[in-house]
């Protein structure tokens, strides 16, 4: 990028540059029209018969350098060929010299600084590549010369450019003074400011564009070269903030439109709001959940919104004495989540009718809550009680919802209490083929014992076909048809109106080896 300090083509008034000395044959200002018919000013000099050592100087006005360290001067000029000038002497030249002089203010006068090299700094002696030829009575023909010179390094507030003629016949058609700067650049969402290079290369720190944030790592920088070009190098730049996406060739961050969101900074574009959410404003980093829908604390910001599940369905209960097996079907609506668990609430009502939350004597297997499978076994039910179980389905957002949690209830009434297990079995008599057993009558809480069931099998014969049962109304029994000298395992349970109690502990008994021993009482 070039920044103009002076362009005579654009000047709308007389240039009125200073000449020295005040003699005939000096530089003179002329006006004409450029290709666009705009008025332009030029300077001419043609003192080809000058006295030896006589120089004609032309000095521009003071030009503020505006921070430039190196300034470029593009000269457009024509130069008349000395051979075309019939009165040209040996002093005719086809070159001119360019100088500059620095100062902190417009302090030069008609006589100062002294019109000579030092204090003026010589830039170059300029020779014409193209010479203009002129024949008497005819128009001059020849190409315009274009020469760009480099001034500097400059350090003061401004400078003057000066042209020294020592016998040329020439026209200075235009002068363009400019400096080079790196234009403002936006790349990878990083803005690098317009920079005037002060050295061969200058590092320039970038800043993130609006609504962008720095990427991790070193802060982005580019190098501005002396020629006004940015040195190519990868830029670890910035990325659009949450709620914004890169646009216009990675030069801007654009707010996410309504109905879209972007949860994180970085690459990637705005996405439509996930299920059951919406964004009513632009620039959303997160979409708001619809009423009744939620995100769990652990859900990503871009996750769909979910709702608590509906109640479990079809609870099936199987009561077995003091234990209960409950089983149910998954809810119709999972709420859009996979972290489904179940929990149970329990109330118990005594035979007399007073109800309360279940006591601590109940056990739940695997537990009363955080169940992942749709079943539970409840143990320790008390006889002749009515239990109400409420089975609820829960998920990761159930705790966020207000209002009652839907449940599926099931009522279970336990039987009156069965007799306790029969223990203390003793063998009253044994023979090679029979065993006589007796036991204490258990204390049945709900009425008398109606009868007993004896369950026995030979030790080592564990299959169902080897187990035999015997019913007896007395608290004794005789087992017949047994094997000689064999061991038997015996269990007894009692039955009352409430039903059978549990079998007692296994009792170990043995038949006699032969008859000669006769009947023998055995105490268990």
């Amino acid at each position: 990028l070039e920044e103009t300090l002076l362009n005579t083509k654009l000047e709308t008034a007389d240039l009125k540059w200073v000449t020295f000395p005040q003699v005939d044959g000096q530089w003179e200002e002329l006006s004409g029209l450029d290709e666009e018919q705009h008025s332009v000013r030029t300077y001419e000099v043609c003192d080809v018969q000058r006295a030896p050592g006589q120089a004609h100087w032309l000095r521009t006005g003071w030009v503020p350098r505006r921070g430039a360290v190196h300034v470029y001067a593009t000269l457009r000029f024509t130069m008349l060929e000395c051979l075309s000038l019939p009165r040209a002497g040996r002093s005719c030249k086809e070159t001119f010299t360019v100088f500059y002089y620095e100062s902190d203010a417009d302090t030069a006068t008609a006589l100062t600084p002294a019109w000579m090299e030092n204090p003026y700094i010589k830039v170059d002696t300029v020779a014409a590549e193209h010479l203009t030829r002129k024949r008497p009575g005819a128009e001059a023909t020849g190409k315009v010369n274009v020469k760009t010179l480099r001034l500097g390094p400059l350090s003061k507030a401004g400078f003057y450019l000066a042209f020294q003629d020592q016998g040329a016949c020439m026209a200075l058609l235009s002068l363009h003074l400019f400096y080079k700067k790196c234009a403002q650049l936006t790349v990878n969402l990083t803005r690098f400011p317009e920079t005037v290079p002060r050295e061969l290369v200058v590092p320039v720190a970038g800043s993130c564009v609006v609504d962008a944030v720095p990427a991790p790592g070193p802060s982005p920088s580019l190098y501005c070269r002396e020629d006004g070009q940015w040195a190519e190098q990868p830029v670890t730049g910035c990325s659009c903030a949450p709620g914004f996406e890169a646009a216009e060739g990675n030069t801007k961050c654009r707010a996410c439109a309504q109905g879209t969101f972007k949860p994180l900074s970085g690459e990637g574009s705005c996405q439509p709001c996930p299920a059951n959410s919406h964004s009513n404003t632009i620039g959303s980093a997160v979409c708001q959940c619809r009423v009744g829908y939620f995100r769990a604390r652990t859900d990503p910001r871009g996750a769909p919104c979910t709702t608590p599940p509906s109640a479990p369905r079809s609870v099936v209960s199987r009561l077995n004495g003091s234990s209960l097996h409950l089983e149910w079907s998954a809810p119709l609506e999972s709420g859009g989540r996979e972290d489904l668990t179940y929990a149970l609430r329990c109330r118990e009502c005594r035979p007399g009718g007073s109800c309360a939350p279940c006591g601590g004597d109940l056990t739940f297997d695997p537990g009363p809550r955080d169940l992942v499978e749709p079943w539970v076994v409840v143990r320790g039910l008390r006889p002749d009680f009515t239990y109400t179980f409420e089975v609820t389905a829960l998920n990761g957002v159930s705790s966020l919802a207000t209002g009652p949690v839907p449940f599926e209830p099931v009522n279970v009434t336990t039987d009156r209490e069965v007799p306790p297990a029969v223990s203390d079995i003793r063998v009253t008599r044994s023979s090679p083929s029979s065993l006589s057993l007796a036991w204490a009558v258990p204390r049945a809480p709900s009425g008398a014992v109606l009868d007993y069931e004896v369950k026995y099998h030979e030790k080592g014969a564990e299959g169902p076909s080897s187990v035999r049962f015997l019913k007896t109304s007395e608290n004794r029994a005789e087992l017949r048809g047994l094997k000689r000298g064999a061991s038997y395992l015996v269990q007894v349970r009692a039955r009352s109106e409430a039903g059978y109690g549990p079998f007692g502990q296994e009792h170990h008994s043995q038949t006699q080896l032969d008859e000669s021993e006769g009947w023998r009482e055995q105490l268990a």
Partner: antibody
Framework: QVQLVESGGGLVQPGGSLRLSCAAS????????MSWVRQAPGKGLEWVST??????????FYAAPVKGRFTISRDNSKNTLYLQMNSLRAEDTAVYYC???????????????????WGQGTLVTVSS | DIELTQPPSVSVAPGQTARISCSGD??????VHWYQQKPGQAPVLVIY???KRPSGIPERFSGSNSGNTATLTISGTQAEDEADYYC???????????FGGGTKLTVL
């Protein structure tokens, strides 16, 4: 000898037309930017029009009071400058001078801003 | 556009210095030229580019221009210098020329 000689002046009625001529000699006419300047009786000088040197289609410039009524032109083969005056008004009564602008050494695209050569003038009277 | 203002008349004794002014807004930024016109004659250029003298013009004629005023100075005025003097400059449109109203110099 370097000179400019105007002709074509005279008495003309308001609304009438007149064509002034200026014959140049002693210099390269086709390298010179030429102008007309007038002077009403007892008044000061007033620039009228300028034509640049290059032909054909040289650029022309006019003072506001005459724009659209006067036309400047030149015939380089005859070394002559013209001013065609139409729709003449009483206020156009003046001595009309042909004047040369300072010339470039060799580039007729440019001229100096002063008039360095003048003709003796021709009187134009617009009256009924 | 710029307007150039001159005093209608200036009187000077022979041999004295006559100064004729020409004023206009920021005139010092423009080149000013001076013309001499004697009765019944065409104008003659006496000063151009503020202070330059054409060949054939006596050295007693000089010019300056700064600020809002340009000045034509005639040192050691002679009777033959009695004439009307006009200043001129470009207008802002550059190719248009404006003249001052003229100053009648009387040599007493």
């Amino acid at each position: 000898q370097v000179q400019l000689v105007e002709s074509g002046g005279g008495l003309v009625q308001p609304g009438g037309s007149l064509r002034l001529s200026c014959a140049a000699s002693g210099f390269t006419f086709n390298n010179a930017w030429m102008s007309w300047v007038r002077q009403a009786p007892g008044k000061g000088l007033e620039w009228v029009s300028t034509i640049e040197a290059k032909m054909p289609n040289g650029a022309t410039f006019y003072a506001a009071p005459v724009k659209g009524r006067f036309t400047i032109s030149r015939d380089n083969s005859k070394n002559t400058l013209y001013l065609q005056m139409n729709s003449l008004r009483a206020e156009d009564t003046a001595v009309y001078y042909c004047a040369r602008k300072g010339m470039s050494f060799y580039n007729n695209k440019y001229a100096k801003s002063m008039f360095d050569l003048w003709g003796q003038g021709t009187l134009v009277t617009v009256s009924s | 556009d710029i307007e150039l203002t001159q005093p209608p008349s200036v009187s000077v004794a022979p041999g004295q210095t006559a100064r004729i002014s020409c004023s206009g807004d920021n005139l010092g930024k423009k080149y000013v030229h001076w013309y001499q016109q004697k009765p019944g004659q065409a104008p003659v250029l006496v000063i151009y580019y503020d202070s330059k003298r054409p060949s054939g013009i006596p050295e007693r004629f000089s010019g300056s221009n700064s600020g809002n005023t340009a000045t034509l100075t005639i040192s050691g005025t002679q009777a033959e210098d009695e004439a009307d003097y006009y200043c001129s400059a470009w207008t802002t449109t550059m190719m248009h020329i404006v003249f001052g109203g003229g100053t009648k110099l009387t040599v007493l």
